[in-house]
Interface confidence: low
């Protein structure tokens, strides 16, 4: 067969859909690989062809678009299942071609089962709500394009297994779920079930997402360095191990990159000849505030090392801070027993 630009199996787009529900899957070629859209391709005389490989098989097969009630159909660049079945799981390929051009990509589709409480192997999107921030909303995701705007679906919201009605601070408003004041107790999985009619049939769309209540930007502060501080002096004798922890608290900030680093005499440890190691640990609070600890360690410190400047730095979207550790050389205690003994003429 003639050459075809094969983009391979696009595992970045691992598509999961629920069994016995409608699913609409766009050919990824136009979204991520080609610089033109389906309409342009169609106008240029290119044809979109679909085929698939069943789970645990190597054989590529055409998709059967002649099933009863048009269970599987194609519309423009979308492959429709009305509804899905478990054995629809497999790798699907969409190929765009004419006599002189060919491009194709495959993607995995997994049809998953859910139980009566909406538990399933589905990977859930996480929606973060700010704690005690005023009214915030989540929206039932990925339901666009399933029904025309003239169709008014019914939407039922659940928290875990429970239908949301008469909850104190959570109110269903159609496609939206409003949290009047988000609290830690609102953490959990929320499911919207969208029911709509089509050609005399009733379809259900189930969408579950995880709500995580996080620190509010109203309470966010620049990084706080707890250690090193002015109260602790790292007093060492040459040859001893020097351990200095840098412990920094970061308020939760959406999409903020939290950084901690040490400088020694103004240089990064990598740029200096000392044998220094740095170990980092990270912990999080319930609202995803972060505490990072970086321990600077010099196994056998020299008197030169004890004269250097050790500074802990921290940066977040809220600002940058730095704190120097107080490091000094321990003055050896006088060895009185020997000196006094010598003074009295002992041998």
């Amino acid at each position: 067969s003639e050459r075809c630009d094969d983009w391979g199996l696009d595992t970045m787009r691992q598509i999961q859909v629920f069994e016995d529900e409608p699913a609409r899957i766009k050919c990824p070629l136009f979204e991520h690989f080609l610089k033109f859209n389906y309409s342009t391709a169609h106008s240029a005389g290119l044809t979109l062809i679909w085929y698939w490989t069943r789970q645990d098989r190597d054989l590529e097969e055409p998709i059967n678009f002649r099933l009863p009630e048009n269970r599987i159909s194609k519309e423009k660049d979308v492959l429709w299942f009305r509804p899905t079945l478990l054995n629809d799981t497999g790798n699907y390929t969409c190929m765009l071609r004419n006599t002189t051009y060919c491009s194709k990509v495959a993607f995995p589709l997994e049809v998953v089962q859910k139980d009566s409480c909406f538990n399933s192997p589905m990977k859930l999107p996480v929606h973060k709500l700010y704690i005690e921030y005023g009214i915030q909303r989540i929206t039932c995701p990925n339901v666009d394009g399933y029904f025309p705007s003239s169709v008014k679906p019914t939407i039922t919201w659940y928290m875990g297994c429970y239908k949301i009605q008469n909850f104190n601070n959570v109110i269903p408003e159609g496609m939206n779920l409003s949290f009047l004041i988000a609290l830690i107790s609102n953490n959990g999985n929320y499911t919207c079930v969208v029911t709509y009619p089509e050609n005399g049939r009733t379809f259900h769309l189930t969408r579950t997402l995880t709500v995580k209540v996080v620190g509010s930007p109203k309470n966010a502060v620049p990084p706080v360095i707890h250690s090193p501080n002015d109260h602790v002096v790292y007093e060492k004798e040459p040859g001893e191990e020097l351990l200095i922890p840098c412990t920094v608290y970061f308020s939760f900030l959406m999409d903020s990159r939290n950084e901690v680093w040490w400088t020694i005499d103004g240089k990064k440890p990598d740029d200096i000849t000392i044998d220094v190691t740095i170990n980092e640990s990270i912990s999080h609070s319930r609202t995803e505030d972060e505490t990072r600890t970086q321990i600077l360690s010099i196994k056998k410190v020299t008197s030169e090392d004890l004269k250097r400047s050790y500074v802990c730095h921290a940066r977040s979207a809220k600002g940058e801070v730095a704190k120097a550790a107080k490091v000094k050389q321990k003055v050896p205690a006088p060895r009185y027993t020997v000196e006094l003994a010598c003074g009295f003429g002992a041998t």
């Epitope: 005023g134 104190n168 601070n169 009047l180 004041i181």
Partner: antibody, heavy 117, light 110 residues
Framework: QVQLQESGPGLVKPSETLSLTCTVS????????WNWIRQPPVKGLEWIGY???????NYNPSLKSRVTMSVDTSKNQFSLKLSSVTAADTAVYYC???????????WGQGTLVTVSS | QSVLTQPPSASGTPGQRVTISCSGS????????VNWYQLLPGTAPKLLIY???QRPSGVPDRFSGSKSGTSASLAISGLQSEDEADYYC???????????FGGGTKLTVL
């Protein structure tokens, strides 16, 4: 139909504490934020603060040191106390519900409180 | 001195269109939604516009709201004598961690 009604003394002496109560009828104090807003004579509206059913509060920073709000879920009421009042605290005091859209969608009729000896 | 700035007065003749502006900053209007309230003499304030431009049920479509950057405006078309009232804009202020109002605009129907 949710309705709000303010009640309390219309006259308070300087340096004393102003106390008002808002009764919620036709609905519950559970959920929503319950706010106090005031309007001094020939001046604009000023937000005093809010309370929720669990007792969580947020006060106007300029009044914070003098304001205390409380809620009584059994009576479906919430209250405002403003200490050390002066003539500048003379105003029509409104209670209002902060609804689903971050807006005061239901208001009480307002009660005029005069601070005078 | 109000955090949000409104013109103290506005006027128009019946049938005309009037616009009331509300100017703020990045910590209030710039990052939060704007609401508008109508205060008719002797009655409780009434929510006129929420979430920048949404009208609660019962508010005539003659009232419309808009927001751009750190400013918002309320437009009243087909002005009627019963529209004579005080109008206030309001928004949450992230810096003050509280609700702020404009100074109010007195609308006179000539």
């Amino acid at each position: 139909q949710v309705q709000l009604q303010e009640s309390g003394p219309g006259l308070v002496k300087p340096s004393e504490t102003l106390s008002l109560t808002c009764t919620v009828s036709g609905g519950s104090v559970f959920s929503y934020f319950w706010n106090w807003i005031r309007q001094p004579p020939v001046k604009g509206l000023e937000w005093i603060g809010y309370i929720d059913h669990s007792g969580g509060t947020n006060y106007n920073p300029s009044l914070k040191s003098r304001v205390t709000m409380s809620v009584d879920t059994s009576k479906n009421q919430f209250s405002l106390k403003l200490s050390s009042v002066t003539a500048a605290d003379t105003a029509v005091y409104y209670c209002a519900r902060e609804g689903l859209h971050d807006a005061f969608d239901i208001w009480g009729q307002g009660t005029l409180v005069t601070v005078s000896s | 001195q109000s955090v949000l700035t409104q013109p103290p007065s506005a006027s128009g003749t019946p049938g005309q269109r009037v616009t009331i502006s509300c100017s703020g900053s990045s910590s209030n209007i710039g990052s939060n939604t704007v609401n508008w309230y109508q205060l008719l003499p002797g009655t409780a304030p009434k929510l006129l516009i929420y979430s920048n431009y949404q009208r609660p049920s019962g508010v005539p479509d003659r009232f419309s709201g808009s927001k751009s950057g750190t400013s918002a405006s309320l437009a009243i078309s087909g002005l009627q004598s019963e529209d004579e009232a005080d109008y206030y804009c309001a928004a949450w202020d992230d810096s003050l961690n509280g609700r702020v109002f404009g100074g109010g605009t007195k609308l006179t129907v000539l």
